[in-house]
Interface confidence: low
C-alpha cells in the first residue's frame, strides 16, 4: 500500500490585503477515512484555520467540494486577507478517530500579505518658531507590509535631506510602521511653503503616497512697526501713524497708550493677504496739541500671537508749536524708542 | 456602477449549441468568484455552474460534461459555453457575482432567455 | 446534494403585518445561508448573507437567523412591494443548491 501523502505545492503565497488567498493541498490517497484539517503555525500553540468536519469558518471556504467522497482537493480559499493572516499555513490528515489522530502534515505555505501603507500624516510644531529657527516635522504610516519603504521628504518640490526614518519592529511582523523626523530651517518667506512626506511601498504600483503640512501652521513673522506723524493740522491736531508691516498670523492687537495711559485698542480683523501670505495694518491717532498743557508721549503698543508687546513710542513737544509742519516724521524702528516732534 | 449584462440567449434546437456572455461593469470580474443560475419559466431558481477567482470550475450534475464555464479578464466578461442542449436546459440564465467574503450573491444581471425546442 | 426545503409554499399576509418563512437543510450549513426575493418578470434580489447579515440597501425590516440546519427570514411590518416570491440558499459547498420557493400573496 503506498504511503499517503499530503502535498502542498507552493512554498510561498503572496496576496495583496483585502483579496483572496488560494491555499492548495492534495492527498495522494482517502484511505485511511479521516477529516482534513487547515492550521496557522505548527506545534502545540497552532491555530485551527479550518476544519471540513465541523465548525464555522466564514472567512474560509473550500476550493472543491470536501462532502463529494473521491475528492482528494483540501485546498481552501480565505477571503480579505489582512496582514494579521501572515505565516505558514498547514494541510494536515487526520485518521478517523476517538479523537482523531493526526497522520500526516503537507510541508507548509506561507502566506506572505502586501499591505499598503497607511496615508502619511504629517504633524508640525505645537509651537510657531519664527524665521531662522529649525522646527520638526513627523511622519507617520502604518500597516504595510512587506518591511521595505522608502520615505522622502520635500520642501516645496525640494527634496530634503535633514531627516531620520525608522520602520517598526525591527524583526518579523505581519505589519510595520514607518516614522519620521525632518528639521526644516524656516524663512519669513514660507507661510506659503509646504513640506511634503512621499511614502513608496511596492503595493502602490509607483504611485507614492503623500502627506503634506502647511508651513503656515509651524511659522511666526513678527511685525516691523513704523510710527510717522503727518503734518500738524489747522485744527491744532496731530494725525499719528501706526504702520505695522510682515506679520504672520493675522492675530494681532494694537493699543495706543498716552502718557502711559490706554487711548484705544484694536484687533486685526479681516486683513488682505500680501502676496508672500504676510500681513499690514495701519492705525492711525489724532492728537489735539491744543488740549495739552504739557509734552504727549504716545506709544504704539503691538502684542502679536500672544508674544511680548512690542513698543514704538515718541514725544509731541506742546509748548512751541507752529500751525504748519514739514515733512512727515517718523519713529526709528526698534523696540522703545522715542522721539520727539516739534 | 456595479451591474451584469447578459447576452447570447435565444431559440436553439435539441443538441445545439448556444454560448452566453456576461459583461460586468463597476468591479473586477476576475476578483470574485462568478456564478451561472437558470430559472426555468414558473419554476424555482437553479444554480448551474461557478467559477473561482484562481479558475476553478463548478457545475450541477445535469451540466457536467456539457457546459463550460469561462472567463476572459481582459473583457471584464463571464461566459458560459452549452453544447448537447435539452429541453430541459430551456430557461431565464442569470449572471450571479459572489461576495467578497464568502461567495454569498450580491449581484444579478437581468437575465436572457435560452429556448431548447424543434 | 444538500436539500433545502422551504415552508410554506405559499402564504397570504395583510399590509403591516409581520411575517416568518422557515429553511430547512438536509445537512449542517453552518451559517452560509442566502435569502433572495424575486418578483414577477424580474431577477432575484439579494436580501441576506451568512444568515442574518443584510446587503447594503437592504431595509431592517428584514432580519435572518438561523445556524446549522434550521433557518429563518423575518419581515416585521409587510408593505406592498414586499409581496414577493423569496427563495434560501445554501452555499456551503458546490452544488449550490436553492429552496423551491414561498410565494408571498396579499390577503
Known amino acids: 500500500e503506498e504511503e499517503l501523502q499530503v502535498i502542498q505545492p507552493e512554498k510561498s503565497v503572496s496576496v495583496a490585503a483585502g483579496d483572496s488567498a488560494t491555499l492548495n493541498c492534495t492527498v495522494s490517497s482517502l484511505i485511511p477515512v479521516g477529516p482534513i484539517q487547515w492550521f496557522r503555525g505548527a506545534g502545540p500553540g497552532r491555530e485551527l484555520i479550518y476544519n471540513l468536519k465541523e465548525g464555522h469558518f466564514p472567512r474560509v471556504t473550500p476550493v472543491s467540494d470536501p462532502t463529494k467522497r473521491n475528492n482528494m482537493d483540501f485546498s481552501i480559499r480565505i477571503s480579505n486577507i489582512t496582514p494579521a493572516d501572515a505565516g505558514t499555513y498547514y494541510c494536515v490528515k487526520f485518521r478517523k478517530g476517538s479523537p482523531d489522530v493526526e497522520l500526516k502534515s503537507g510541508a507548509g505555505t506561507e502566506l506572505s500579505v502586501r499591505a499598503k501603507p497607511s496615508a502619511p500624516v504629517v504633524s508640525g510644531p505645537a509651537v510657531r518658531a519664527t524665521a531662522e529657527h529649525t522646527v520638526s516635522f513627523t511622519c507617520e504610516s502604518h500597516g504595510f507590509s512587506p518591511r521595505d519603504i522608502t520615505l522622502k521628504w520635500f520642501k516645496n518640490g525640494n527634496e530634503l535631506s535633514d531627516f531620520q526614518t525608522n520602520v517598526d519592529p525591527a524583526g518579523k511582523s505581519v505589519s510595520y510602521s514607518i516614522r519620521s523626523t525632518a528639521r526644516v530651517v524656516l524663512t519669513r518667506r514660507d507661510v506659503h511653503s509646504q513640506v511634503i512626506c512621499e511614502v513608496a511601498h511596492v503595493t502602490l504600483q509607483g504611485d507614492p503616497l503623500r502627506g503634506t503640512a502647511n508651513l503656515s501652521e509651524a511659522i511666526r513673522v513678527p511685525p516691523f512697526l513704523e510710527v510717522t506723524q503727518q503734518s500738524m493740522r489747522a485744527d491744532n491736531q496731530v494725525n499719528v501713524t501706526c504702520q505695522v508691516t510682515k506679520f504672520y498670523p493675522q492675530r494681532l492687537q494694537l493699543t495706543w497708550l498716552e502718557n502711559g495711559n490706554v487711548s484705544r485698542t484694536e484687533m486685526a480683523s479681516a486683513l488682505p493677504e500680501n502676496k508672500d501670505g504676510t500681513y499690514n495694518w495701519t492705525s492711525w491717532l489724532l492728537v489735539n496739541v491744543s488740549a495739552h498743557r504739557d509734552d504727549v508721549k504716545l506709544t504704539c503698543q503691538v502684542e502679536h500671537d500672544g508674544q511680548p508687546a512690542v513698543n514704538k513710542s515718541f514725544s509731541v513737544k506742546v509748548s512751541a508749536h507752529p500751525k504748519e509742519q514739514g515733512s512727515n516724521t517718523a519713529a526709528e524702528n526698534t523696540g522703545t524708542n522715542e522721539r520727539n516732534i516739534y | 456602477e456595479v451591474q451584469l449584462v447578459e447576452s447570447g440567449g435565444g431559440l436553439v434546437q435539441p443538441g445545439g449549441s448556444l454560448r452566453l456572455s456576461c459583461a460586468a461593469s463597476g468591479f473586477t470580474l476576475s476578483s470574485y468568484d462568478m456564478h451561472w443560475v437558470r430559472q426555468a419559466t414558473g419554476k424555482g431558481l437553479e444554480w448551474v455552474s461557478a467559477?473561482?477567482?484562481?479558475?476553478?470550475?463548478y457545475y450541477t450534475g445535469s451540466v457536467k460534461g456539457r457546459f463550460t464555464i469561462s472567463r476572459e479578464n481582459a473583457k471584464n466578461s463571464l461566459y458560459l459555453q452549452m453544447n448537447s442542449l435539452r429541453a430541459a436546459d430551456t430557461a431565464v440564465y442569470y449572471c450571479v457575482r459572489g461576495g467578497v467574503w464568502d461567495d454569498a450573491f450580491d449581484i444579478w444581471g437581468q437575465g436572457t432567455m435560452v429556448t431548447v425546442s424543434s | 446534494d444538500i436539500q433545502m426545503t422551504q415552508s410554506p409554499s405559499s402564504l397570504s399576509a395583510s399590509v403591516g403585518d409581520r411575517v416568518t418563512i422557515t429553511c430547512r437543510a438536509s445537512q449542517d450549513i453552518n451559517n452560509y445561508l442566502a435569502w433572495f426575493q424575486q418578483k414577477p418578470g424580474k431577477a432575484p434580489k439579494s436580501l441576506i448573507y451568512t444568515a442574518s447579515s443584510l446587503h447594503s440597501g437592504v431595509p431592517s425590516k428584514f432580519s435572518g437567523s438561523g445556524s446549522g440546519t434550521d433557518f429563518t427570514l423575518t419581515i416585521s411590518s409587510l408593505q406592498p412591494e414586499d409581496f414577493a416570491t423569496y427563495y434560501c440558499q445554501q452555499y456551503v459547498s458546490y452544488p449550490y443548491t436553492f429552496g423551491q420557493g414561498t410565494k408571498l400573496e396579499i390577503k
Open positions: 467559477i473561482g477567482t484562481a479558475g476553478d470550475t
